[in-house]
């Protein structure tokens, strides 16, 4: 058993049929010695008396808010949460495995630039009695500060018969240098509590590996005289690190017909313009990627090829 | 003589082309090593990220773009950065700070060159002959060093008589290649910035 925060305790349980559970001793936070009784949650049933209460925690029925009373007055509370371990592995019932970029990916994080600011998100099908808290640092043995904001419900989606909820959090490294060469990874720890179940999820990454630029902006087409070619131009996204000559992007340009069954025309360039063959009903798209470190490509920015 | 007067390539700044080749070679060599050493801990998540140039050079700080000098987090170790009013060609106009930046890059390359050669000598003694560095990566390091053209004391190649631990040597190669690729990214950024200045 360990303390998660004041008056909230996590009991770690090996979860298998007929498991013996954990013996837990609760102590009433009071100078009083006599006439103390204990109850669990809203039930008025007295579980025991005395300054301490010893319980065997085996299942969720044994978890909850234990309160010690004297003369009808509550003296202190202890909330017990369960953290299940099945076959030596901590449970991951609350969050959905996003399977990207690999299996057992519960937290996904992205950064729009090298400023030390990043966003993490996770998915769940649970809609009520759910709370999250997030901690982050650079490195674990001698951690350097990362400040995370409040967790927000960022999206709701219908997936078949189920509703899926996306939660996200924004974090900022306290003293980040965009040009720095990262040697220690950023660690992100998410505590999830659903009713009386506690779970924790972690992710470890370098900012350079989670970079995903915003799409290029101001995408424009200029038809060339007496030609079916057009000159397309675009600009670096506003959110990208500066100076651009140091934090350079490379671009992929694509001309795609109205159908996915039509062949695409793709060009790769470091410039912010290109000449392409445009055709009726096609659209022109451009995406960006760090020129020197192959992290994610941005989403596409698109305009019709008319 | 601090900076080269190498023949200009398509860029005004002849080191840019060499730095691009350096990054390509670093990335390809790392990718190849990860494939060959697939049963060794050789991924970014598995290795310790060491920096053999730590406390010996200060490339990131010495080569900071002007725009980042105001960022205190970028100047935690040394308050040095270049002023960009020159190129690898215009050696007399090149500022002291830029020379410091390019010298730091040169020293990095020299250190990695020695490490890679030492490691290759060990790996060539491996009866498995599983992996060794091809001449491409050593060649591109050499080309960029020549383009930078600094005089420098030659660092003796470390040689050991005892039989190396080949497992440890291969892990060390992974660590070295990861670090070298990160430094190659920095070098390419710097050269691109200088080329645009």
């Amino acid at each position: 058993i360990w303390e998660l925060k004041k008056d909230v305790y996590v009991v770690e349980l090996d979860w298998y049929p007929d498991a013996p559970g954990e013996m837990v001793v609760l102590t009433c936070d009071t100078p009083e010695e006599d006439g103390i009784t204990w109850t669990l949650d809203q039930s008025g049933e007295v579980l025991g008396s005395g300054k301490t209460l010893t319980i065997q925690v085996k299942e969720f029925g044994d978890a909850g808010q234990y309160t010690c009373h004297k003369g009808g007055e509550a003296l202190s509370h202890s909330l017990l949460l369960l953290h299940k371990k099945e076959d030596g592995i901590w449970s991951t019932d609350v969050l959905k495995d996003q399977k990207e970029p690999k299996n057992k990916t519960f937290l996904r994080c992205e950064a729009k630039n090298y400023s030390g600011r990043f966003t993490c998100w996770w998915l769940t099908t649970i809609s009520t009695d759910l709370t999250f808290s997030v901690k982050s640092s650079r490195g674990s043995s001698n951690p350097q500060g990362v400040t995370c904001g409040a967790v927000t419900l960022s999206a709701e989606r219908v997936r078949g018969d189920n509703k899926e909820y996306e939660y996200s959090v924004e974090c900022q490294e306290d003293s980040a240098c965009p040009a720095a060469e990262e040697r220690l990874p950023i660690e992100v720890m998410v505590d999830a509590i659903h009713k009386l179940k506690y779970e924790n999820y972690t992710s470890s990454f370098f900012i350079r590996d989670i970079i995903k630029p915003d799409p290029p902006k101001n995408l424009q087409l200029k038809p060339l005289k007496n030609s079916r070619q057009v000159e397309v131009s675009w600009e670096y996204p506003d959110t990208w690190s500066t100076p651009h000559s140091y934090f350079s992007l490379t671009f992929c340009i694509q001309v795609q017909g109205k159908s996915k069954r039509e062949k695409k025309d793709r060009i790769f360039t470091d410039k912010t313009s290109a000449t392409v063959i445009c055709r009726k009903n096609a659209s022109f798209s451009v995406q960006a990627q760090d020129r020197y470190y192959s992290s994610s490509w941005s989403e596409w920015a698109s305009v019709p090829c008319s | 003589r601090n900076l080269s007067v190498a023949t200009p390539g398509p860029e005004m700044f002849p080191c840019l082309h060499h730095s691009q080749n350096l990054l390509k070679a670093a990335s390809n060599t790392l990718q190849k090593a990860r494939q060959i050493l697939e049963f060794y801990p050789c991924t970014s998540e598995e290795i310790d990220h060491e920096d053999i140039t730590k406390d010996k050079t200060s490339t990131v700080e010495a080569c900071l773009p002007l725009e980042l000098i105001k960022n205190e987090s970028c100047l935690n170790s040394r308050e040095t950065s270049f002023i960009t009013n020159g190129s690898c060609l215009a050696s007399r106009k090149t500022s002291f700070m830029m020379a410091l930046c390019l010298r730091s890059i040169y020293e990095d390359l020299k250190m990695y060159q020695v490490e890679f050669k030492t490691m290759n000598a060990k790996l060539l003694r491996d009866p498995k002959r599983q992996i060794f560095l091809d001449q491409n990566i050593l060649g591109v390091i050499d080309e960029l060093m020549q383009a930078l053209n600094f005089n420098s004391e030659t660092v003796p190649q470390k040689s050991s008589l005892e039989e190396p631990d080949f497992y440890k040597t291969k892990i060390k190669l992974c660590i070295l290649l990861h670090a070298f690729r990160i430094r190659a990214v920095t070098i390419d950024r710097v050269m691109s910035y200088l080329n645009a200045s």
């Epitope: 007496n226 030609s227 079916r228 070619q229 001309v255 017909g257 159908s259 996915k260 069954r261 039509e262 062949k263 695409k264 025309d265 793709r266 060009i267 290109a274 000449t275 392409v276 063959i277 055709r279 009726k280 | -």
Partner: antibody
Framework: QSLEESGGRLVTPGTPLTLTCTAS????????MTWVRQAPGGGLEWIGT????STYYASWAKGRFTISRTSTTVDLKMTSLTTEDTATYFC????????????WGPGTLVTVSS | LVMTQTPASVSAAVGGTVTINCQAS??????LAWYQQKPGQRPKLLIY???TLTSGVPSRFKGSGSGKQFTLTISGVQREDAATYYC?????????FGGGTKVVVV
């Protein structure tokens, strides 16, 4: 508007050969360009296509045939030629992409024989 | 992608009707064209987008179909229509000609 292929000749097996397609009356760089071949007495066979810079090839042509373009020409580079590659080689212009070929050259004959 | 063209050859009297079929091994929507080739000549585009007639091509040529099944119909066949006809289908990675249909006008 017209297209013309050149470079076809008699070669021995294994010899590399490059065919060139040139245009009159229009700009090649404004169109997807395609190479097609026809063995003597046989049907038409699509070799590959070049867009602005993307290339697509028939599975049998991948690795052995390469299409490239300059502002005025489209080339078909062929390696490891065998007697099976004996054919008339046509270059054609795509109206939109590479299936609606509205303008064809007269073709150039490549004969591979030992 | 495989394009199966039938029949391999067909005879027709002047004024008659000829139907040529082309089957794609997968859905290619309307990315199909029909070509006419006479001996010793280069191919000529008749129809593209499965049913759009190329300018200058007589209206007796008609293309239909989409997805996997396509048809070229020549109504009121003329002597000059004697030729080999090919379908050409395309998807997002490859392009394939049918085997050809030789039309003989009697």
């Amino acid at each position: 508007q017209s297209l013309e292929e050149s470079g076809g000749r008699l070669v021995t097996p294994g010899t590399p050969l490059t065919l060139t397609c040139t245009a009159s009356g229009f700009s090649l760089s404004s169109y997807w360009m395609t190479w097609v071949r026809q063995a003597p007495g046989g049907g038409l066979e699509w070799i590959g296509t070049i867009a602005t810079s993307s290339t697509y090839y028939a599975s049998w042509a991948k690795g052995r045939f390469t299409i490239s373009r300059t502002s005025t020409t489209v080339d078909l580079k062929m390696t490891s030629l065998t007697t099976e590659d004996t054919a008339t080689y046509f270059c054609a212009r795509g109206l939109t992409t590479d299936y609606d070929l509205d303008l064809w050259g007269p073709g150039t004959l490549v004969t591979v024989s030992s | 992608l495989v394009m199966t063209q039938t029949p391999a050859s067909v005879s027709a009297a002047v004024g008659g009707t000829v139907t040529i079929n082309c089957q794609a091994s997968e859905d290619i929507e309307s990315y199909l064209a029909w070509y006419q080739q006479k001996p010793g000549q280069r191919p000529k585009l008749l129809i593209y987008s499965a049913s759009t007639l190329t300018s200058g091509v007589p209206s007796r040529f008609k293309g239909s179909g989409s997805g996997k099944q396509f048809t070229l119909t020549i109504s009121g066949v003329q002597r000059e229509d004697a030729a080999t006809y090919y379908c050409l289908g395309a998807d997002d990675t490859t392009t394939v000609f049918g085997g050809g249909t030789k039309v003989v006008v009697v």
